[in-house]
């Protein structure tokens, strides 16, 4: 139960944590299990113990084996085992399965790929990221803290992602790489910041004085059933019900529609017998959910009657 698999590449740094943990004040002794030989704590050694951590700086294939750690407290001892395998560097691009960390999944929303084991190392930003051995370039990829963010994830983003960073130990630098698979799932549902499909921002709608006019506010909120999502109209920043103009009414209830699999809502604003003063008002289509509020503004302009005289 208290055994942990760890792996690394020759000539890279590898740091392994004891699978048994205790207070920072407890002493931890490390041994090479095959020979029962104690691992030194002096940092001048290539392989040395530092409390709960066993450091290979850098690692060599011959370091492979089982290491025993014993956490010692005044009242008890706890024993753990670290099964360490150091592999030769591959000449080709393929990362074999035995070097892969756990697979992570992403979706249509922003996805994060965390660099495995990085919290064990003394590293400084930025991380370098590679996909199938190619350095990642383009605005969709952002190296942030200990993870990679991919914007607008697509199925083509699936693949093996490698993070590369430098571990610093007493002024000496050691390279570390770690690889994990990333899969893209077709999600059952999600919510997103509202996207207004209509009207366009700052749209001018032509209307005829004395006639009726309809304005439709339409927005999408994600995939699947949406909770606390709404579209509505405001006049000069005021709710329709509070504005007090009976000629201008919102349709009762919101119509739900689906566009490209997205859940959308629309609300119609009906203006009866359009008057000159209606052209002076600001009409705001608001779409909101728990992610926030988006607003598109519409103004009305008089439609010029067709001139029949030439």
């Amino acid at each position: 139960k208290f055994s942990k698999q760890s792996w690394g590449l020759e000539n890279e740094a590898l740091i392994v944590r004891c699978p048994r943990q205790g207070k920072p004040s407890y002493t931890v002794d490390w041994y090479y299990s095959q020979t029962n030989k104690s691992i030194p704590t002096q940092e001048r050694n290539r392989v040395f113990a530092s409390g709960q951590l066993l450091k290979f700086l850098p690692a060599a294939v011959a370091d492979s084996g089982i290491y025993t750690c014993i956490v010692r407290s005044p009242t008890f001892n706890r024993t753990g085992y670290a099964n360490v395998t150091i592999y030769k560097k591959q000449s080709d691009c393929n990362v074999p399965d035995y070097l892969m960390y756990s697979t992570v999944s992403g979706s249509e929303k922003n996805s994060k790929i965390y660099c495995p084991t990085i919290d064990l190392y003394n590293w400084t930003a930025p991380l370098e990221w590679f996909k199938n051995c190619q350095a990642l370039q383009g605005s969709r990829y952002r190296a942030h803290k200990s993870f990679l963010v991919i914007d607008n994830v697509m199925t083509e983003d699936a693949g093996d992602y490698t993070c590369k960073f430098i571990h610093n130990e007493n002024g000496a630098n050691y390279s570390v790489t770690a690889t994990r698979s990333f899969t893209v799932k077709d999600e059952q549902g999600f919510s997103l910041f509202p996207v207004i499909g209509a009207p366009a921002q700052n749209e001018i709608k032509e209307v005829e004085i004395g006639k009726n006019a309809n304005l439709t506010c339409s927005a999408c909120f994600g995939k699947g059933t949406q909770f606390l999502a709404a579209v509505l109209w405001q006049l000069n920043g005021t709710k329709i019900t509070d504005f007090g103009e009976p000629r201008i009414q919102q349709e009762e209830g919101q119509n739900q529609s689906f566009s490209n699999g997205l859940a959308c809502l629309d609300m119609v604003l009906r203006i009866a017998d359009v008057k000159e003063e209606d052209l002076l008002l600001q009409y705001d289509c608001l779409a909101l959910n728990l992610h926030g509020l988006r607003r598109h503004t519409v103004r009305l302009s008089r439609k010029n009657p067709i001139d029949h005289h030439s």
Epitope: S111, K112, K145, K185, E187, Q188, S191, A230
Partner: antibody, heavy 125, light 107 residues
Framework: QVQLVQSGAEVKKPGSSVKVSCKAS????????IIWVRQAPGQGLEWMGG????????DYTQTFQGRVTITADESTSTAYMELSSLRSEDTAVYYC??????????????????WGQGTLVTVSS | DIQMTQSPSSLSASVGDRVTITCRAS??????LNWYQQKPGKAPKLLIY???SLQSGVPSRFSGSGSGTDFTLTISSLQPEDFATYYC?????????FGQGTKVEIK
């Protein structure tokens, strides 16, 4: 500082209704959504519904649809949760909480950042 | 709705221990995950949002990590005031759902 203060404990008979209030202070009430969560004795957290006060938009999770009504009074910066047709399994602590998204600068993250102290509702014959 | 599953449901630990709680989502939720702490008779308190960001005023011994479906809350050195129940919550799809909780007790 931001505070949500809820009304006191209630003892109710099965079949009756209860109305719990949640008074907000220390921030602009209309800029944030308020949600209601309940916790039965020794159980986890269950989301009931919520309201976006400035627009009066309320919504309820499927479990509570038809039995719960959430309202907000902008003038007193108070949100209300009314639960009807009470049964013994509705005995729980009811919490109001603020959603961290500010509607007027769309800033922040998505979480319940401030909570009321809770209101114990006991349903017993 | 998205199901959130926490493990373990309870654990016993000593002051100074490093404690790890995991949370798994029934579908990928990117990094839209929060962690809350609740003490008996009190309301929950937000600790971590967006999987790894520490809420203002929360001690740095609390940290969160993970993305996709698997997430972790770590308390690097358990303090007496940390004995409580911890809940994860997804904010990827409404309604935002909670895990069933993990109770951290004194050994």
């Amino acid at each position: 500082q931001v505070q949500l203060v809820q009304s006191g404990a209630e003892v109710k008979k099965p079949g009756s209704s209860v109305k719990v209030s949640c008074k907000a202070s220390g921030y602009t009430f209309t800029n944030y959504a308020i949600i209601w969560v309940r916790q039965a004795p020794g159980q986890g957290l269950e989301w009931m519904g919520g309201i976006i006060p400035v627009f009066g938009t309320a919504d309820y999770t499927q479990t509570f649809q038809g039995r719960v009504t959430i309202t907000a009074d902008e003038s007193t910066s108070t949100a209300y949760m009314e639960l009807s047709s009470l049964r013994s399994e509705d005995t729980a602590v009811y919490y109001c909480a603020r959603v961290s998204t500010n509607y007027y600068d769309s800033s922040g993250y998505y979480a319940f950042d401030y909570w009321g102290q809770g209101t114990l509702v006991t349903v017993s014959s | 709705d998205i199901q959130m599953t926490q493990s373990p449901s309870s654990l016993s630990a000593s002051v100074g221990d490093r404690v790890t709680i995991t949370c798994r989502a029934s579908q990928s939720i990117s990094s839209y995950l929060n962690w809350y702490q609740q003490k008996p008779g009190k309301a929950p308190k937000l600790l971590i949002y967006d999987a790894s960001s520490l809420q203002s005023g929360v001690p740095s011994r609390f940290s969160g990590s993970g993305s996709g479906t698997d997430f972790t809350l770590t308390i690097s050195s358990l303090q007496p005031e940390d004995f409580a129940t911890y809940y994860c919550q997804q904010t990827y799809h409404t309604p935002w759902t909670f895990g069933q909780g993990t109770k951290v007790e004194i050994k």
